[in-house]
Interface confidence: low
């Protein structure tokens, strides 16, 4: 399965926020998207394997790390109102 946490988050601007994504399928490929009205899903960052991270189309202000197969935490380095969104994590073989 693949799980994200927290389900909901309210934070002050300027705070660092980390969203967790964990998958138990041993998938190599993991992705973070944000969903906004009028834009659909936009790719933020993705990883093809351990220690591999790549920028998507809207990566500014975000970072990810991949220290193991199962996890790809997404960090909002300094939360901004423009980062208010619905975030989705995905994985694939």
């Amino acid at each position: 399965e693949i799980t994200q946490s927290p389900r909901h988050k309210i934070t002050e601007t300027g705070r660092q926020v980390t969203l967790a994504c964990h998958q138990t399928w041993n998938h190599n490929n993991m992705f973070w998207y944000r969903q906004d009205l009028g834009h659909g899903l936009r790719l933020i960052h993705y990883s093809y394997g351990v220690h591999d991270t790549n920028k998507g189309e809207v990566s500014d202000g975000y970072s990810v790390s991949r220290s193991n197969t199962e996890d790809l935490p997404l960090t909002l380095e300094s939360a901004a109102s423009s980062q208010t969104s619905v975030y989705f994590c995905a994985s694939s073989e």
Epitope: N28, N29, Y48, G49, V50, H51, D52, T53, S67
Partner: antibody, heavy 117, light 107 residues
């Protein structure tokens, strides 16, 4: 079946250079981080270098920084280790290994580097 | 940098005997990995994430531990278990560190 086959080991004089190769088969090479790990004559294991799956990131143990370069050719399913300014303490069996997370889940049979005058 | 210290460095056990070897860590870590190496061959992943057995590893092997102390146990020694066992840990940068090994011989 996962296979990693190293080649290129040789006897080299101190200060010399050498390039090791590791031909990979049996898995999707471009999806995995890869490392070189060496085993010294006293049987100790030492991680040498890591390259991320796409080749964007490389990491080295302190003793080889600036002397060794890890690279990969995902089209050829091959991992490389370019070594220069070789020292006697680089003498070892060099293994290429696949990452299964923060560990090494498959290892090659090894190739031997001897640095001696 | 994290230092892994394995003990004993050499040990022997009789068939059927319970065997325990340890890996001490210089600072607390979350998990440990173990490899088996027989003479003239490359290391094999044996136990990962402290207690998970790699494919093909007999159920008589187990791993445990937390913090700064980890162990590998064989519930009943068999001749084919004679080998050198290495513990391994990862730390950020990244750096991968191995213990010096425990050589297990059969009596």
């Amino acid at each position: 079946e996962v296979q990693l086959v190293e080649s290129g080991g040789d006897l080299v004089k101190p200060g010399g250079s050498l390039k090791l190769s590791c031909a990979v088969s049996g898995f999707t090479f471009r999806s995995y981080g890869m490392s070189w790990v060496r085993q010294t004559p006293d049987k100790r294991l030492e991680w040498v270098a890591l390259i991320s799956s796409g080749g964007s990131y490389t990491y080295y143990t302190d003793s080889v920084k600036g002397r060794f370069t890890i690279s990969r050719d995902n089209a050829k399913n091959t991992l490389y280790l370019q070594m220069s300014s070789l020292k006697s303490e680089d003498t070892a069996i060099y293994y290429c290994s696949r990452h299964g997370g923060n560990f090494f889940d498959y290892w090659g049979q090894g190739t031997t580097l001897t640095v001696s005058s | 940098q994290i230092v892994l210290t394995q003990s004993p460095s050499i040990m022997s056990a009789s068939p059927g005997e319970k065997v325990t070897m340890t890996c001490s860590v210089s600072s607390s870590v979350s998990y440990m990995h173990w490899y088996q190496q027989k003479s003239g061959t490359s290391p094999k992943r044996w136990i990962y994430d402290t207690s998970k057995l790699a494919s093909g590893v007999p159920a008589r092997f187990s791993g445990s531990g937390s913090g700064t102390s980890y162990s590998l146990t064989i519930s009943s020694m068999e001749a084919e278990d004679a080998a050198t066992y290495y513990c391994q840990q990862w730390s950020s940068n990244p750096q991968y560190t191995f213990g010096g090994g425990t050589k297990l011989e059969i009596k």
